[in-house]
């Protein structure tokens, strides 16, 4: 797979971790969770042309019958290879509690 | 998540497993593969609706931000979540070998 | 590593049915290409192609013993069986499993020793 | 069913000879042909796969050729070990079958 910098479309356009600043309004999750007020959401975006950051085999087939059949296989996406924990203080019947979660902030990304 | 035949934008237009048919020639595998000569591809097309089969709380935010942000934040897409091994008749210097690649086939999709 | 290993009776009478068990290690039943075949050989004699499962449950037989035979496979225990019905002293032979890969025995596992006799 | 004929039945070579098999399909096969050897009191091993790719582990002395009706394996220089009985395979159609086996032996 080609160095993650490295992407053919132009610097940034390529799949990549990026930041977006959310809300709890904007999450949804106003009404249970307390803190933090805003989040600093990692998330992976951007295109995955031909190999770049392919993830495994499949994305490697992907990638070829993609070029073969644009509109009934669509190119690989660009998803999270691995999470960062992040923790939520909730509201409770009673008061709060700290919650951990595993499966809410991308690391790093690839394409599948 | 929604059951996975439960697709808001009509039937078989969400994230499913489907199967295409690709030849060596196709995969590009002609020149390191033997056998077989043709592959049923099991890949995850379709659409990733609204919490439809969300693979965990990134996509469930994913889907929240799209909603907010749709030209920065991509919709959750729809990518293996396990996958089914294979084994390939690999043509190496002196004749062949059996390898097996658990990562290949789609097993089953998710959203993220 | 591949390994098989075939398990029977040893010793059969005439009518009765034979049942054999192939136990396989290093490779999964359920991976896309792979099968088990059933091959036997009469002793000091040729090889016989008997039957084979697919990874996808297909199942092909010879035809000349089609009616006598059965096979099938448990994928959580590894395992494939041969089932033989109303056997013969001609049913009498070494009764291999082997891996397959697309249509060829790629691996053979030691062979069991059925014989048929009042 | 597909007839396999192999010959001879029997041959007897010396250490360091070239050793040819011959193996006759009763119909076009393509490439869809396998060669085993069987050591005394062994299981049989694959050798050759679609008629002349050696399989992993497969000594370089051994080699496989043809297409369509007729297919050969060809030792180049016969060594003590390679004392067994060969057989063809034909995958091409069910059911499988088997050439009747080439027995070689160590003058």
């Known amino acids: 797979a080609r160095n993650g910098d490295d992407c053919p479309l132009g610097p940034g356009r390529c799949c990549r971790l990026h930041t977006v600043r959310a809300s709890l309004e904007d999450l949804g999750w106003a009404d249970w969770v307390l803190s933090p007020r805003e989040v600093q959401v990692t998330m992976c975006i951007g295109a995955c042309p031909s190999q770049f950051r392919a993830a495994n085999m499949h994305a490697q087939i992907k990638t070829s019958l993609h070029r073969l059949k644009p509109d009934t296989v669509p190119a690989p996406c660009c998803v999270p290879a691995s999470y960062n924990p992040m923790v939520l203080i909730q509201k409770t019947d009673t008061g709060v509690s700290l919650q951990t979660y595993d499966d809410l902030l991308a690391k790093d990304c690839h394409c599948i | 998540a929604r059951n996975g035949d439960d697709c808001p934008l009509g039937p078989g237009r969400c994230c499913r497993l489907h199967t295409v048919r690709a030849s060596l020639e196709d995969l590009g595998w002609a020149d390191w593969v033997l056998s077989p000569r043709e592959v049923q591809v099991t890949m995850c097309i379709g659409a990733c609706p609204s919490q439809f089969r969300a693979a965990n709380m990134h996509a469930q935010i994913k889907t929240s931000l799209h909603r907010l942000k749709p030209d920065t934040v991509p919709a959750p897409c729809c990518v293996p979540a396990s996958y089914n091994p294979m084994v390939l008749i690999q043509k190496t210097d002196t004749g062949v070998s059996l390898q097996t690649y658990d990562d290949l086939l789609a097993k089953d999709c998710h959203c993220i | 590593q591949v390994q098989l290993q075939e398990s029977g009776p040893g010793l059969l009478k005439p009518s009765q049915t034979l049942s054999l068990t192939c136990t396989v290690s290093?490779?999964?039943?359920?991976?896309?290409?792979?099968?088990v075949g059933w091959i036997r050989q009469p002793l000091g004699k040729g090889l016989e192609w008997l039957a084979n499962?697919?990874?996808?449950?297909?199942?092909y037989y010879n035809s000349a013993l089609k009616s006598r035979l059965t096979i099938s496979k448990d994928t959580s225990k590894n395992q494939v069986s041969l089932k033989l019905s109303s056997v013969t002293a001609a049913d009498t032979a070494v009764y291999y499993c082997?891996?397959?890969?697309?249509?060829?025995?790629?691996?053979w596992g030691q062979g069991t020793l059925v014989t048929v006799s009042s | 069913d597909i007839q396999m004929t192999q010959s001879p039945s029997f041959l007897s070579a010396s250490v360091g000879d070239r050793v040819t098999i011959t193996c006759k399909a009763s119909?076009?096969?393509?490439?869809?042909v396998a060669w085993y050897q069987q050591k005394p009191g062994q299981p049989p091993k694959a050798l050759i796969y679609?008629?002349?790719y050696r399989y992993s582990g497969v000594p370089d002395r051994f080699s496989g050729s043809g297409s369509g009706t007729d297919f050969t394996l060809t030792i180049s220089s016969l060594q003590a070990e390679d004392v067994a009985v060969y057989y063809c395979?034909?995958?091409?159609?069910?059911?499988?079958?088997f050439g009747q086996g080439t027995k070689l032996e160590i003058k």
């Open positions: 082997a891996q397959m890969a697309y249509s060829w025995f790629a691996y």
């Open positions: 290093g490779f999964s039943l359920s991976t896309y290409g792979m099968g």
């Open positions: 499962i697919w990874w996808n449950d297909d199942k």
């Open positions: 119909q076009n096969m393509d490439t869809n």
């Open positions: 679609s008629a002349s």
């Open positions: 395979q034909q995958y091409n159609s069910y059911p499988f079958t």
